[in-house]
């Protein structure tokens, strides 16, 4: 499937419009906001009951090349003790983003956008039980 | 820009940088991958620090629907099902990309814009500042 | 407009125990939390409990043992339950409405006009 | 528990003149979240207490804009530009980031 094309419902094509060749697209990869920080809390990975740990993945045809995954700690959660509960579970929470591949067939050059299954941290949840009939 | 490795028998004219422009195809490798996470799972009301998850959406943007996670507490819920305040709720938040229609209104014509997200919940110890 | 009415407030004695109601209009209690705060005659005010929009609930660790707040979903009321009463326990007791849930602002923005219950031999 | 501590206790203002109530808190109200849960009340004589400031300076919707909040932390002030006669009353500062959420002791405003 492609990227919908914008409806009428919204708007006109404008004739500013670039021309682009058919079945493709033009996109331009420096970043709106690339200086944002995110502000999340201090070391939430660390003080999470589900903590986790993270880990850069580098690829050099993809843009951007790295991306930080998080890996739950434990299979359990952590106790008002610091100890492991096994009666609830860390789970991985995911987001899904975009990258730009870059991919060689021969001396050619062809780039195709990706949709990357990012974990960004893990959450504490009561499991579901399922009784055996 | 990136370095990219080259093919030894290339002419030397490719530029070894990801181009600030490119030519992309229109199709999305793992396009089909579920984006609704209240059908993905039910992860956001059986944690410890439940939340709610909130629709942005905008036409000029791909993917035009984005889902915010809002901690539902402040504190995290304990075994009794009570919010419990010695423990705080916190949003996981995350840098993604998504495209941005650029000049606005075009169809083909996008450009990376990195927005910041709230993907869910978790609960952390809180970090206890008294008053001198 | 959002309403919020107390009753089943009055004169018991020591040891005794009473259910504060409070109805509610205007909103829907899955969609808010109501709190339940008290104040003694000329004294400041003293929250109680609350019973969040998803139904969990929050005490005030000195009273927990002797309150139990709930709320009925259908008649959109909310109740306090209040077993072993001492005469410290004598005060007008407001339920306040929490702002909507999709705000995060964790504050009172509706009261009722209050409920007095005394405790007295 | 955190407690709070208004001063003053008592604030008898010219009408037209401003008026400043602080409140300091025994421990810092910012949540691991980032957000402070900080708020003031009015009780007016013989009535409800009802809603000013939300989140240390929002104003809640209708509340006249002579009232403005600010602080962080643990110091937090409630500013009056202009005193009319209609704001007497007892003002409350109050915390909801921990529980028991808790209110301070009330400053009672009085027109000289």
């Known amino acids: 499937r492609k990227i919908p094309k914008v409806g009428h419902t919204f708007f006109q094509k404008p004739e500013s419009c670039p021309p682009v060749p058919g079945g493709s697209m033009k996109l331009d990869i420096g970043i709106i906001n690339e200086n944002q920080r995110v502000s999340m809390s201090r070391n939430i990975e660390s003080r999470s009951t589900s903590p986790w740990n993270y880990t850069v993945t580098w690829d050099p045809n993809r843009y951007p090349s790295e991306v930080v995954q998080a890996q739950c700690r434990n299979l359990g959660c952590i106790n008002a003790q610091g100890k492991e509960d096994i009666s609830m579970n860390s789970v991985p929470i995911q987001q899904e983003t975009l990258v730009v591949r870059r991919k060689h067939q021969g001396c050619s050059v062809s780039f195709q956008l990706e949709k990357v299954l990012v974990t960004v941290g893990c959450t504490c949840v009561t499991p579901v039980i399922h009784h055996v009939q | 820009g990136i370095t990219i490795p080259r093919n030894p028998g290339c002419p030397n004219s490719e530029d070894k940088n990801f181009p600030r422009t490119v030519m992309v195809n229109l199709n999305i490798h793992n396009r089909n991958t579920n984006t609704n996470p209240k059908r993905s799972s039910d992860y956001y009301n059986r944690s410890t620090s439940p939340w709610n998850l909130h629709r942005n959406e905008d036409p000029e943007r791909y993917p035009s629907v984005i889902w915010e996670a809002k901690c539902r507490h402040l504190g995290c819920i304990n075994a009794d099902g009570n919010v419990d305040y010695h423990m705080n709720s916190v949003p996981i938040q995350q840098e993604i990309l998504v495209l941005r229609r650029e000049p606005p209104h075009c169809p083909n014509s996008f450009r990376l814009e990195k927005i910041l997200v709230s993907v869910g919940c978790t609960c952390v110890t809180p970090i206890v500042h008294h008053v001198a | 407009e959002v309403q919020l009415v107390e009753s089943g407030g009055g004169l018991v004695q020591p040891g005794g125990s009473l259910r504060l109601s409070c109805a509610a209009s205007?909103?829907?209690?899955?969609?808010?939390?109501v709190h339940w705060v008290r104040q003694a005659t000329g004294k400041g005010l003293e929250w109680v409990s609350v019973i969040w929009s998803d139904g969990t609930t929050t005490y005030n660790s000195a009273l927990k043992s002797r309150f139990t707040i709930s709320r009925e979903n259908a008649k959109n009321s909310l109740y306090l339950q209040m077993n072993s009463l001492r005469a410290g326990d004598t005060a007008v007791y407001y339920c306040?409405?929490?702002?909507?849930?999709?705000?995060?602002?964790?504050?009172?923005?509706?009261w009722g006009q209050g409920t007095t219950v005394t405790v007295s031999s | 528990d955190i407690v709070m501590t208004q001063s003053p206790l008592s604030l008898p203002v010219t009408p037209g003149e401003p008026a400043s109530i602080s409140c300091r808190s025994s421990?810092?109200?910012?949540?691991?979240?980032?957000?402070?849960?900080f708020h003031w009340y009015l009780q007016k004589p013989g009535q409800s207490p009802q809603l000013l400031i939300y989140?240390?300076?929002n104003r809640f919707s209708g509340v006249p804009d002579r009232f403005s909040g600010s602080g962080s932390g643990t110091d937090f002030t409630l500013k009056i530009s202009r005193v009319e006669a209609e704001d007497v009353g007892v003002y409350y500062c109050s915390q909801t980031t921990h529980a028991p959420f808790t209110f301070g002791q009330g400053t009672k405003l009085e027109i000289k």
């Open positions: 989140k240390v300076s």
């Open positions: 306040a409405r929490d702002t909507h849930y999709r705000l995060y602002y964790y504050a009172m923005d509706y």
């Open positions: 205007g909103f829907s209690l899955d969609s808010y939390g």
């Open positions: 421990q810092s109200l910012v949540h691991s979240n980032g957000d402070t849960y």
